[in-house]
């Protein structure tokens, strides 16, 4: 849930959590399922060509509170959502790219920043 442009991390569980992983599967994952002491996440961001790319996976408890806050980064269109309420809960997360700000529009193929 977002308030004032930020999302807060849900409460971690007292047991291991299994998450779907896509483009972000660690070595210890099995059949696109990873495990964590922290959160499941789904993230959408623009690649270098401006195409939206969705990744999902596990975030460890250490530092994940900050990562799940989704603090806006200048010149980067990215959105992340986190969950812990059940295993593979990130299957049901559908973050959307934040809208383009005026200064991010470009007139032609040359990207001025």
């Amino acid at each position: 849930k977002k308030e004032d442009g930020e999302s807060t991390a849900p409460t971690p569980r007292p047991k291991i959590l299994r998450c779907k992983c896509h483009h972000h599967c660690p070595e210890d994952s099995v059949n696109n399922i990873c495990s964590t002491d922290g959160y499941c996440f789904t993230m959408i961001e623009e690649d270098d060509s401006g195409m939206p790319v969705v990744t999902s996976g596990c975030l460890g408890l250490e530092g994940s509170d900050f990562q799940c806050r989704d603090t806006p980064i200048p010149h980067q269109r990215r959105s992340i959502e986190c969950c812990t309420e059940r295993n593979e809960c990130n299957k049901d997360l559908h973050p959307t790219l934040p809208p383009l700000k005026n200064r991010d529009f470009v007139d032609g193929p040359i990207h001025h920043k």
């Epitope: 569980r13 007292p14 047991k15 291991i16 299994r18 660690p26 070595e27 210890d28 994952s29 099995v30 990873c34 495990s35 964590t36 002491d37 922290g38 596990c58 460890g60 408890l61 250490e62 059940r86 295993n87 593979e88």
Partner: antibody, heavy 116, light 112 residues
Amino acid sequence: QVQLQQPGAEVVKPGASVKLSCKASGYTFTNYWMQWVKQRPGQGLEWIGEIDPSDRYTMYNQKFKGKATLIVDTSSSTAYMQLSSLTSEDSAVYFCARFGYYVDYWGQGTTLTVSS
Amino acid sequence: DVVMTQTPLSLPVSLGDQASISCRSSQSLVHSTGNTYLHWYLQKPGQSPNLLIYKVSNRFSGVPDRFSGSGSGTDFTLKISRVEAEDLGVYFCSQSTHVPFTFGSGTKLEIK
């Protein structure tokens, strides 16, 4: 205190199925996974799989897929493991065990004997 | 599957001696979260296993401080500083980093 109660023994015929039970008490049942482990004399311990009672999510050892089915009844804080198409190879002690990030409490185990 | 190799298979000791059991894994047990999920259990005859050490070096509640665990990556050790009669039984290492979770074959601690 944490307790996992299992029946001491079960005797079943080859080809039949059996449903082993594990009644949990002394903690919040949905806060931990429940694992099942097989022990045969001289064969060590084998992890069968686990179930999260809060959402009934299961993970299985590939070796036991099709052989074992894990279920829970949260109203009675009881975990069950159904074993099907039993053969003499299934004769063993079966433990249930509470798992958060590691197994901290085990049931006393049910000795399953498959015999005609 | 991750293979857990325990040595020795049998460890004859005199009461009061130090005992050391080794456990090696076929893959690193460092989880992607940074935790190492390697644990030690003691199983006495006719009983279920009891947790001694979790996550390499943490003693479980009620476990005497003569038990200690150490190691990293693929190489782990359980030490008992002064063996007492109640310590006799089979010791297992176990990993919960990789699915399927696996166990060592056990080390039988017995009186010399």
